[in-house]
């Protein structure tokens, strides 16, 4: 039961995380105009990975896409790439994990295969989360660098009559969404990897014997030897005598003729 719960929770957490990564990638507020100590501004600028926007005090908002590819900063391109890789890996991970879920039966899929798929999706989620965290962190670092550079040059032409105020940008909501989402995807991935260990016990290969203390007769569980997954420390073929005691997870893990739909 614990394995199913861990796997299910890992899947849900990863699903929320990937949805968050997608949301963060699409959001326009990666960087927002620093308002200093002034909460009300006549013209408010904010930028995303794909377009920049201006919101006026009149309520009018205008957004312009970055229609150039070569003219964009390399760092922005790198952030875009990291976020897209994170989304793609996460999406594949979700697809794989759906089939790996213990509560879903697909044909005669064995536990070893489910364990492998759970591990694969877990690793994918971990890499996806790391990609998102890396992408957001790179962008945040870029903002911090630019912020202090523009602070140093806050006013140009101070010697003359004319002043030009440089627009400073600070962290937008998308960065926090991205960090949280990346973290959730990472946690979900770790949970999937933990669940994988439970799905593939140390002694995976068995010829199960069901013992009943009440009588002399011994019922043999059909199924023969199972292929080794390699997750256990002992990969030799052994007969497992379980004395009639089984956990709910173990009961679920033995395929029988009743499993096929």
């Amino acid at each position: 039961m614990a394995v199913t719960a861990c796997q299910g929770l890992g899947f849900v957490v990863s699903l929320i995380g990937i949805a968050g990564i997608i949301a963060a990638t699409c959001m326009d507020q990666w960087s927002t105009q620093d308002l200093y100590n002034n909460p009300v501004t006549a013209v408010f600028n904010y930028q995303g990975l794909w377009r920049s926007c201006v919101r006026e005090s009149s309520g009018f908002t205008e957004c312009r896409g970055y229609f150039t590819l070569l003219g964009l900063p390399a760092m922005l391109q790198a952030v875009r790439a990291l976020m897209i890789v994170g989304i793609v890996l996460g999406a594949i991970g979700l697809l794989v994990s759906i089939f790996a879920l213990k509560c879903i039966r697909i044909g005669s899929m064995e536990d070893s295969a489910k364990a492998n798929m759970t591990l694969t999706s877990g690793i994918m989620f971990i890499v996806s989360g790391l990609c998102a965290i890396a992408g957001v962190s790179v962008f945040a670092n870029m903002l911090v660098t630019n912020f202090w550079m523009s602070t140093a040059n806050m006013y140009t032409g101070m010697g003359g009559m004319v002043q030009t105020v440089q627009t400073r940008y600070t962290f937008g909501a998308a960065l926090f969404v991205g960090w949280v989402a990346g973290g959730l995807t990472l946690i979900g991935g770790v949970m999937m990897c933990i669940a994988c260990r439970g799905l593939a016990p140390e002694e995976t290969n068995y010829k199960a014997v069901s013992y009943h203390a009440s009588g002399h007769s011994v019922a043999y569980k059909p199924g023969g030897f199972k292929a080794s997954t390699g997750f256990g420390s002992n990969t030799k073929n052994k007969k497992i005598y379980d004395g009639g005691a089984r956990t709910e997870d173990e009961v679920q893990s033995y395929p029988s003729k009743h499993d096929y739909v």
Epitope: V40, S58, G59, R64, T164, T167
Partner: antibody, heavy 115, light 113 residues
Framework: EVQLVESGGGLVQPGGSLRLSCAVS?????MNWVRQAPGKGLEWVAW????????TYADDFKGRFTISRDDSKNTLYLQMNSLRAEDTAVYYC???????????WGQGTLVTVSS | DIQMTQSPSSLSASVGDRVTITCKSS????????????LTWYQQKPGKAPKLLIY???TLESGVPSRFSGSGSGTDYTLTISSLQPEDFATYYC?????????FGQGTKVEIK
């Protein structure tokens, strides 16, 4: 079509108070009060976000004037306290539009501060 | 606060003349986010409310005749009336629409010669 109709102007003694109203019909996201002293130029007084009620004022009017709105009546207000002779002017309400320009104006209401 | 300085304060012109009014701001009105200058021009006739002519320094408000045009960027802006018409005799104001507090120029009165 947006229509703005001001009211509430009149004669008031120095140190007195007055509340101007601007009845708004049509879509407005944000509104302004602008005044014009006799024979002088335009002077921006205050701005308000009609949805959040968030205001901002010109430095000369902070603390004395309060801009507000009533959602149910779709009305804009300017509460003026501690009035001085130099506050004598025609007060206009105006709607903010693209480029933060003021595209619709009321007809104006005259406020005279005199003893 | 941004100071707006208009010149000339008044001018005399005849119908058909080309008229240019300049406006200078103490700070750039160009917004880096959309590369637009937040300068607005108004026309006001005696006893009437002002009328919006131009926003974003050069965008003509709907219903405004095409003889009116605006130009400029940064701190220097101009309003041009290509061929002055009888109804154009009025006072013209420029306005900083870039940052609060919004500030107006002192106005330019266009009179009949």
């Amino acid at each position: 079509e947006v229509q703005l109709v001001e009211s509430g102007g009149g004669l008031v003694q120095p140190g007195g108070s007055l509340r101007l109203s601007c009845a708004v019909s049509g879509y407005t996201f944000s509104m302004n009060w602008v005044r014009q002293a006799p024979g002088k130029g335009l002077e921006w007084v205050a701005w308000i976000n009609m949805y959040t009620g968030e205001p901002t004022y010109a430095d000369d009017f902070k603390g004395r004037f309060t801009i507000s709105r009533d959602d149910s009546k779709n009305t804009l207000y300017l509460q003026m306290n501690s009035l001085r002779a130099e506050d004598t002017a025609v007060y206009y309400c105006a709607r903010s539009s693209m480029g933060n320009g003021f595209d619709y104006w009321g007809q104006g209401t005259l406020v005279t501060v005199s003893s | 606060d941004i100071q707006m300085t208009q010149s000339p304060s008044s001018l005399s012109a005849s119908v058909g003349d080309r008229v240019t009014i300049t406006c200078k701001s103490s700070q750039s009105l160009l917004n880096s986010g959309n590369q637009k200058s937040y300068l607005t021009w108004y026309q006001q006739k005696p006893g009437k409310a002002p009328k919006l002519l131009i926003y974003w320094a050069s965008t003509l408000e709907s219903g405004v005749p095409s003889r009116f045009s605006g130009s400029g960027s940064g701190t220097d802006y101009t309003l041009t009336i290509s061929s002055l018409q009888p109804e154009d005799f009025a006072t013209y104001y420029c306005q900083n629409a870039y940052s609060f507090p919004f500030t107006f120029g002192q106005g330019t009165k266009v009179e009949i010669k």
